[in-house]
């Protein structure tokens, strides 16, 4: 018996058919982030909570060391929302003698490192230029796409200020990833 | 015949194969909210369209009083946006005396209710600080992650203030949940 | 042997199985947009990336024109990010005499053209007021949800001002849609 | 059901203020904004302003800015107007108005007349 | 302020005509755009708001179309109650204006 013929007539090749309850799936949500040495030029990664509360990984989906291990390859959805807070940037001072500031930004980007490829790649960007009038501001980026990936591709969330990241709550900072 | 023999040869086990056709699946989108009764100390729930324009609720996922009901447990998909738009806040005002107002923000949370479970679950939170120089503003809020649920859990997606809600049109606000 | 052998106890018709692998998928990535005449009255559409970089388009789902085309009927996950970028708009100007200035603004319409009807139907739209005080602003709006579509159904993106759209990086400005 | 209630008709003398009052009841008061609205007679309406009842925080039209006040208390779910100051085409029903969002009027009170005369 | 124009100022029609509202705004609303019916001596009712939304328990007779500056309320049909004064009213920006009203009468 093959997998094909299930198949819609104007399709002859199929991959084989699978349960969709073992796809490798994870959702990470935000823990505490502890001062860490940070890669000169590249924005600090997150960690994550993996098995507590809202969080899980199963089917092979490993998490280790701020990455997701893509346990197969194929077409998987990733997402990830960063809430951020702070205090009044200075560009939300009023214009002084025209010249106007330079904005503060807040960055999430989503990267994929493949060991076997020197140079990490960057599939989702959120940046956010910042200039609130008022005192303390706060606000998400959300991300969300559909990447190819490669059994052994390692996936990390990285921030442009992880001292702005709330980590309050699971539900305002969070990661996963599931194979379509 | 084990729905197994179509799995990947390091896989054992495996749950039933099923058609992805037949998966529980909701798109909602906003109508009008008429003034109503709150629950005390909790954000007011918005209610739904579900089977006009876009709206659609299928496979036995169900629309009813503000919540979509799961069917069957699985991982689910479950996303919303909410579109709000104010008139400025007060924070906008320049700060007077050195003194920051507290801003105004704008939250939306998907909640999980379980009925044995006696408190709601917060699944995900947007909310972002408001500060907004000029008259009338305007902005969205989305939200998408995926959660294991449980049959007859029920999802609703709260707001902060449910008069700055555009209900003028169902590209700008909806909610929706589909069986990975 | 039937697909419906698989299925719950609780269902009792199945579409035929057919393997995730084999669904029609897209992940379209941003392009430096060249001048083009606009149709009165509609926000212009992007055109987009569908082979180099993290961009592909696989199983029947092709790119042209501006436009993904559905090769087959069913429910798809749709999502767009445009990352603007701009100089302050008047707006920011601090309100002259009480008069707060209408505020400039910024709109992500995912759009879907069927050919036998004659108006565009507006799936999913994203729109923020930018009253930004500073110089130079940045920001993305992320849309996504799902859609019952028909084969021949044809998908694209709009934006209020193309000129604003940030075209520098694939990571920022993206378009995809899958079959779930 | 949702329903609001105004004070009784009024008469006042040029220069006097009067304060309408409107009671909420049916759901929860500081969750919209309320407006009012008024209409002279044979004329059509014209927005005064609202208030956000949960934080007190108001929006006046120009037209009647320094000398409409609106305020609320939340423990008796009721808002009020007062407006200073009357002249002779400030003749008016005043109506009290509640919106599901805040650009709008589901709801009206039955209204309250307002006559100012010497 | 937005203005708000409201044509004709009144008409003359018959029960089971159908009957056309017209409303112009100075600059566009987007669709922001409510509609009222005012009894004499009552306070107004609202009909449609998004511009063409029908607000729960208005009759389907009613509809409304429109976007940007331009308004339409159509009444399919007219009953012996549908006799009223109607006002279209932006909620685009404050302050919010109404239409100076469109009188329905008994011809």
């Known amino acids: 018996l093959k997998g094909q013929e299930f198949a819609p007539s104007h399709q002859q090749v199929y991959a084989p058919l699978r349960a969709d309850g073992d796809k490798p799936r994870a959702h990470l949500t935000v823990v505490r982030q502890t001062p860490t040495q940070h890669f000169k030029n590249q924005f600090p990664a997150l960690h994550w909570e993996h098995e507590l509360g809202l969080a899980f990984t199963k089917n092979r989906m490993n998490y280790t060391n701020k990455f997701l291990l893509i346990p197969e390859s194929g077409d998987y959805f990733i997402y990830s929302q960063v809430t951020f807070r702070g205090m009044t940037s200075e560009c939300s001072e009023i214009r002084q003698a025209g010249r106007p500031n330079k904005p503060d930004s807040i960055t999430v980007v989503i990267t994929k490192v493949t060991d076997s490829y020197p140079e990490p790649t960057q599939l989702l960007m959120g940046t956010k230029s910042v200039c609130e009038v008022g005192s303390n501001w706060f606000q998400p980026i959300y991300l969300g796409a559909m990447f190819s990936l490669q059994e052994g591709d390692k996936l990390m969330v990285n921030v442009s200020d992880i001292s702005l990241v709330d980590y309050t709550k699971e539900d305002k900072t969070f990661f996963g990833a599931f194979l379509l | 015949l084990k729905g197994q023999e179509f799995a990947p040869s390091h896989q054992q086990v495996y749950a039933p194969l099923r058609a992805d056709g037949d998966k529980p699946r909701a798109h909602l989108t906003v109508v009008r909210q008429t003034p109503t009764q709150h629950f005390k100390n909790q954000f007011p729930a918005l209610h739904w369209e579900h089977e006009l324009g876009l709206a659609f609720t299928k496979n036995r996922m169900n629309y009813t009083n503000k919540f979509l009901l799961i069917p069957e447990s699985g991982d689910y998909f479950i996303y919303s946006q909410v579109t709000f738009r104010g008139m400025t806040s007060e924070c906008s005002e320049i700060r007077q005396a050195g003194r920051p107002n507290k801003p105004d923000s704008i939250t939306v949370v998907i909640t999980k209710v379980t009925d044995s479970y006696p408190e709601p679950t917060q699944l995900l939170m947007g909310t972002k600080s408001v500060c907004e120089v000029g008259s009338n503003w305007f902005q969205p809020i989305y939200l998408g992650a995926m959660f294991s649920l449980q049959e007859g859990d029920k999802l609703m997606v709260n707001v902060s203030d449910i008069s700055l809600v555009d209900y003028t049109k169902e590209d700008k606000t909806f909610f929706g949940a589909f069986l990975l | 042997l039937k697909g419906q052998e698989f299925a719950p106890s609780h269902q009792q018709v199945y579409a035929p199985l057919r393997a995730d692998g084999d669904k029609p998928r897209a992940h379209l990535t941003v392009v430096r947009q060249t001048p083009t005449q606009h149709f009165k009255n509609q926000f212009p559409a992007l055109h987009w990336e569908h082979e180099l970089g993290l961009a592909f388009t696989k199983n029947r789902m092709n790119y042209t024109n501006k436009f993904l085309l559905i090769p087959e009927s069913g429910d798809y996950f749709i999502y767009s990010q445009v990352t603007f970028r701009g100089m302050t708009s008047e707006c920011s100007e601090i309100r002259q005499a009480g008069r707060p200035n209408k505020p400039d603004s910024i709109t992500v319409v995912i759009t879907k053209v069927t050919d036998s009807y004659p108006e565009p139907t507006q799936l999913l739209m994203g729109t923020k007021s930018v009253c930004e005080v500073g110089s130079n602003w940045f920001q993305p709006i992320y849309l996504g949800a799902m859609f019952s579509l028909q084969e021949g159904d044809k998908l694209m993106v709009n934006v209020s001002d193309i000129s604003l759209v940030d075209y520098t990086k694939e990571d920022k400005t993206f378009f995809g849609a899958f079959l779930l | 059901e949702v329903q609001l209630v105004e004070s009784g008709a009024e008469v006042k003398n040029p220069g006097a203020s009067v304060k309408v009052s409107c009671k909420a009841s049916?759901?929860?008061?500081?969750?919209?904004?309320l407006h009012w609205v008024r209409q002279a007679p044979g004329q059509g309406l014209e927005w005064m302003g609202w208030?956000?009842?949960?934080?007190?925080?108001?929006n006046y039209a120009q037209k009647f800015q320094g000398r409409v006040t609106m305020t609320r208390d939340t423990s008796i779910s009721t808002a009020y107007m007062e407006l200073s100051r009357l002249r002779s085409d400030d003749t008016a029903v005043y109506y009290c108005?509640?919106?599901?969002?805040?650009?709008?009027?589901?709801?009206w009170g039955q209204g309250t007349m307002v006559t100012v005369s010497s | 302020d937005i203005v708000m124009t409201q044509s004709p100022s009144s008409l003359s029609a018959s029960v089971g005509d159908r009957v056309t509202i017209t409303c112009r705004a100075s600059q566009s609303i987007s669709s922001y755009l409510n509609w009222y019916q005012q009894q004499p001596g009552k306070a107004p009712k609202f009909l449609i708001y998004?511009?063409?939304r029908l607000q729960s328990g208005v009759p389907s007779r009613f509809s409304g179309s429109g976007s940007g500056t331009d308004f339409t309320l159509t009444i399919n049909s007219l009953q012996p109650e549908d006799f009223a004064t109607y006002f279209c009213q932006q909620g685009y920006s404050s302050p919010f204006t109404f239409g100076p009203g469109t009188k329905v009468e008994i011809k």
């Open positions: 998004g511009a063409s």
């Open positions: 108005a509640v919106g599901g969002s805040y650009d709008a009027f589901d709801i």
């Open positions: 049916g759901y929860t008061f500081t969750g919209y904004y």
């Open positions: 208030i956000k009842p949960n934080s007190g925080g108001t």
